[in-house]
Interface confidence: low
Amino acid sequence: TTPEPCELDDEDFRCVCNFSEPQPDWSEAFQCVSAVEVEIHAGGLNLEPFLKRVDADADPRQYADTVKALRVRRLTVGAAQVPAQLLVGALRVLAYSRLKELTLEDLKITGTMPPLPLEATGLALSSLRLRNVSWATGRSWLAELQQWLKPGLKVLSIAQAHSPAFSCEQVRAFPALTSLDLSDNPGLGERGLMAALCPHKFPAIQNLALRNTGMETPTGVCAALAAAGVQPHSLDLSHNSLRATVNPSAPRCMWSSALNSLNLSFAGLEQVPKGLPAKLRVLDLSCNRLNRAPQPDELPEVDNLTLDGNPFLVPGTALPHEGSMNSGVVPAC
């Protein structure tokens, strides 16, 4: 006997559906109506035939009362080939829900997204997370998706993007976006970062995560941020192969005074990089290849310094910097 595709936990909180059959019984997903977190994985199916069975142009207001009654706040949809028209139909209906977080992963969006009709209302998300989502429309995908969202988005995460650069002239500002995560886009690089950080479109960014994004030097990142007018409080550059030295011909970059936390862990550093901000509250240099304790003049003025997991540190060694957060135990790096 084949297992049930959907499982609802005992608290009616989380419901996970794995539709792996070639012709799945989508009605099984109705048992998720009482769940707060819903995950639907479509087993790589092409949902094109689904368009014939639903009226994507139907007025979603007819479903408003039903959708408002749903408890779902976090929705994950994954592993499918989805016509843009179907995605838009879903977004139009979900606009009447109380959904706060939407995650799309391992999706191929085919066709173009139509513009938002005048009478339609956008989806009031707090968080949008995309991982390995490809769009037929190339660089304009963010602008097309954005028009279906209300402007209150706070967190945007884009990983394994096929086109991490956006068509900036089409993108509107994200006035409430405080956290932008572009991690796990190894081909991005500093030039790509400049293209992705559309100038003046992210005025409220406080947290910027760039783990595993092909960044080369902190100074190069500083230049990209300055060009875009992005002034994060927290910057995560961990899991990049960073060079400690700066190209002598490169202009010196002044970091924004707003930056107070910098993560440079797992960056393969053999020495403290040049061109760091002069003052930081938190600096994480753990799990690098530092063979000696950094000298005070190599470091910014910093309250909390983490150096765990570097070769020069052996258990029992005196802490190398006042206020450092080292445990004295080498972590598994």
Partner: nanobody
Framework: QVQLQESGGGLVQSGGSLRLSCAVS????????MGWYRQAPGKGRELVAE??????NYADSVLGRFTISRDNAKNTVYLQMNSLKPEDTAVYYC?????????????????WGQGTQVTVSS
């Protein structure tokens, strides 16, 4: 521990008014949505009014009579109830959707108050 403290319920005559308050004891969370629900004897809990993403939603049965508002400085949400009817009799619950103000994953938490009784006599 996040707690919601409701107040303002009571007995009122038909046509009268009441103002419910709900204070949120919250520090490490940012409030996304706040709302009021009610549950009449033998019935399910239903949405009365909600502040969501900067907009307000009301149940059709209270539209024009009830007004929801929020004081961000006091982390308090109010429900002004005018022209009360006997069918408004219920236990009124405050609800808050909270999300962690820290970094991803942006955790969601739903919190309910203990409820305050509203009785409308004819």
């Amino acid at each position: 521990q996040v707690q919601l403290q409701e107040s303002g319920g009571g007995l009122v005559q038909s046509g009268g008014s009441l103002r419910l308050s709900c204070a949120v004891s919250v520090s490490i969370f940012s409030i996304v949505d706040m709302g009021w629900y009610r549950q009449a004897p033998g019935k399910g809990r239903e949405l009365v009014a909600e502040l969501s993403g900067g907009s307000t939603n009301y149940a059709d049965s209270v539209l024009g009579r009830f007004t929801i508002s929020r004081d961000n400085a006091k982390n308090t949400v109010y429900l002004q109830m005018n022209s009360l009817k006997p069918e408004d009799t219920a236990v009124y619950y405050c609800n808050a959707d909270l999300t962690g103000s820290s970094w991803y994953p942006y955790r969601f938490l739903e919190v309910w108050g203990q409820g305050t009784q509203v009785t409308v006599s004819s």
